[in-house]
Structure formats: structure tokens, C-alpha cells
């Protein structure tokens, strides 16, 4: 095979916190030309070797490029729970996709508070 993508399939983070979305592409021959990050079908960000980074305006206050070709997703909400996809465009070698499932959990403070209230 020309290349492979490794990623943590399932990750979790606390509401209000941040998480790093990271895919690792390895190949003996193919070079990465672009990486697309999507939340389900919605574009999060693009990294292009030629053009640099682009973060979709709807996420620009919460998504920070890096580390490396990954993303740091900040100020997480419960609505951010779901599937995230990295798409690596390579040459030669074509396109490789990785999938991450992010589970955003209530913060421990919220959970403790709720327990005390009950």
C-alpha cells in the first residue's frame, strides 16, 4: 500500500475544555499536499502545503491550527460530540481518510454539583 492513516478512533473531552484532533499519515513514497478536517459534512479547516491554513469562519474562534497537521478544538460543547474526519490528499498516492469519534462529557464540576443536588 502507498500509505496508511493512524488515529485514535474514540476520544473524549470535557465540556468547556479543549481537545487535539490528530491523524498521522505514513508512506514511503507519497507526500501530503493537503489535509481537510470535517465535522460530519461541515468543513472545519484545511491545511495546504502551498497555501497554508484555512479555518472555516464558523469555527474561527474555537479552532486553532496544530499541532502539526492536526487541530486544537477549544471551548467544547455537548453539541460537538460526533464524528470528525481527516482527509489526506497525497501525491502520488491519492486520498486517505481517517475517522475520530469525539465524545464531549459534562465537566466533572457539573457532575459533582448534580450529585450533591440530588
Amino acid at each position: 500500500t502507498a500509505g496508511t492513516i493512524d488515529t485514535k478512533r474514540n476520544i473524549s473531552a470535557e465540556e468547556g475544555g479543549s481537545v487535539i484532533l490528530q491523524c498521522h499519515f505514513s508512506s514511503d513514497t507519497a507526500e501530503v499536499t493537503q489535509v481537510d478536517w470535517k465535522q460530519q459534512d461541515q468543513l472545519l479547516a484545511i491545511y495546504s502545503v502551498d497555501l497554508g491554513w484555512h479555518v472555516a469562519s464558523v469555527f474561527s474562534d474555537r479552532v486553532v491550527p496544530g499541532p502539526s497537521l492536526g487541530l486544537t478544538f477549544q471551548s467544547l460543547t455537548m453539541n460537538d460530540t460526533g464524528e470528525y474526519f481527516c482527509t489526506y490528499h497525497t501525491y502520488p498516492g491519492g486520498i486517505y481518510k481517517g475517522r475520530i469519534f469525539l465524545k464531549v462529557q459534562e465537566s466533572s464540576d457539573d457532575r459533582n454539583g448534580l450529585a450533591q443536588f440530588q
Epitope: T33, S48, V49, D50, L51, G52, W53, Y91
Partner: antibody
Framework: EVQLVESGGGLVQPGGSLRLSCAAS????????MNWVRQAPGKGLEWVSY???????NYADSVKGRFTISRDNAKNSLYLQMNSLRAEDTAVYYC???????????????WGQGTMVTVSS | DIVMTQSPDSLAVSLGERATINCKSS????????????LAWYQQKPGQPPKLLIY???TRESGVPDRFSGSGSGTDFTLTISSLQAEDVAVYYC????????FGGGTKVEIK
């Protein structure tokens, strides 16, 4: 001599369409990423669109969904199909080559002379 | 988008004197993985397309006279023309490409 020559500009009404072409010569066109950059009269420069040597495409938000970039490596040509044109698209449109010597510098090293697009009723 | 702010808007300098143009980006353009600043400078003469002068903030493009030099890192950059020549009259633009490319508004250099 390394050269880029644009054509296809002209006067078009708002909502209309235009197709720009850029003919490349003097270098191995298929090996280079290419761009369209525009300049409104008396204004600064604005990157519009990009196509890599392998066909990966990107657009500025201001033209996404209206403009389509393409290339024909057999003809050493770059194209920009412009639909749903607006008055604010009025500009000189340059094709520009990405500099790829060394590692990617993300700079534009060769520019054409430009073609003028005027959107007006 | 990163906003690139150039100053001054225009500059009048005597022949043989130094011209200094500043460019400030709203975010850092230093890419930590290779320690390169993705900042380029272009020269545009009337009726002509832009010409690449400098990339990676300080690397001169082949064929560009050594009186042109670039410096700076992170968010603050400078283009210096050490000894202005008549043929240097032009508008100068900075361009970042840490994010998708954006250009500064330009600085017009004239002879005093």
C-alpha cells in the same frame, strides 16, 4: 522564457458569466501549482483560487460557489470559470505560479500581465 | 483571515537614501515545525504585474538586487531598500501564507 498570458476578460453584466484562460510556456506546467489573484482598480491584491499540480482545488470565501478553477496540462493552460458575477468582481485577474524550488515558500514567483474583467450594467 | 497592515501608505525618499516599509500581521506567521516565517514581499510598477522580491521573510528571490532586504519574525516585518534607485519607484506589498494568502494594502515609494 517563462511566461504566463491571460485572456478572456471583458465587460459583462451583473449575474453574467466569463471564462478566463492562462497560457503557460517556458516551464513544465504540469509540475506547478497555479493560482488566480485579482486586483480591483486602484486597490490591493486578493488571492482568488488555487489548483495544485495533482488537482487539489481551493477558493477564497468571496468566490466560493461562483468560480471554478481548472487546468489542462496537455494544453499548458489554466482556466477560471466565473459565474453569477457581481460589481465587486471587477478587477484585473492575474494567473500566478507557485514557487516550488527548495521547499514550498508559498510565494508566487511568476505572474501574467493580467486580463481586465468589468462587471457593470 | 490574517489581516496584513502596511505602513506607511506612501513614502518619499531621496535617491541613494534608505527606504523602510513595515508590515504587521494580526497573527504570527511563524510556522513552528520548520521555523519559517511565511511572509513574502512584492514590487509592482505601474501597469505591470507584481514581482516577487523576498520570501520566508528574508530570502531574496533569484535576480533581485541585494539592496532589497527583508527582516522580522512572528508578526512584525520590514522591507528595506538600502539605497533607493529611480527604478525602485513602485508599490510594495507584503503577503502572508501561514493561512490562505492575504496581502497588505501596499506602500507607494516615490522619489523625493
Amino acid at each position: 522564457e517563462v511566461q504566463l498570458v491571460e485572456s478572456g476578460g471583458g465587460l459583462v453584466q451583473p449575474g453574467g458569466s466569463l471564462r478566463l484562460s492562462c497560457a503557460a510556456s517556458g516551464f513544465t506546467f504540469s509540475s506547478y501549482s497555479m493560482n488566480w489573484v485579482r486586483q480591483a482598480p486602484g486597490k490591493g491584491l486578493e488571492w482568488v483560487s488555487y489548483i495544485s499540480s495533482s488537482g487539489t482545488i481551493n477558493y477564497a470565501d468571496s468566490v466560493k460557489g461562483r468560480f471554478t478553477i481548472s487546468r489542462d496540462n496537455a494544453k499548458n493552460s489554466l482556466y477560471l470559470q466565473m459565474n453569477s458575477l457581481r460589481a465587486e468582481d471587477t478587477a484585473v485577474y492575474y494567473c500566478a505560479r507557485h514557487r516550488i524550488a527548495d521547499s514550498p515558500s508559498r510565494a508566487f514567483d511568476i505572474w501574467g500581465q493580467g486580463t481586465m474583467v468589468t462587471v457593470s450594467s | 483571515d490574517i489581516v496584513m497592515t502596511q505602513s506607511p501608505d506612501s513614502l518619499a525618499v531621496s535617491l541613494g537614501e534608505r527606504a523602510t516599509i513595515n508590515c504587521k500581521s494580526s497573527q504570527s506567521v511563524l510556522f513552528s515545525s520548520n521555523n519559517k516565517n511565511y511572509l513574502a514581499w512584492y514590487q509592482q510598477k505601474p501597469g505591470q504585474p507584481p514581482k516577487l522580491l523576498i520570501y520566508w521573510a528574508s530570502t531574496r528571490e533569484s535576480g533581485v538586487p541585494d539592496r532589497f532586504s527583508g527582516s522580522g519574525s512572528g508578526t512584525d516585518f520590514t522591507l528595506t531598500i538600502s539605497s533607493l534607485q529611480a527604478e525602485d519607484v513602485a508599490v510594495y506589498y507584503c503577503q502572508q501564507s501561514y493561512f490562505f494568502p492575504t496581502f497588505g494594502g501596499g506602500t507607494k515609494v516615490e522619489i523625493k
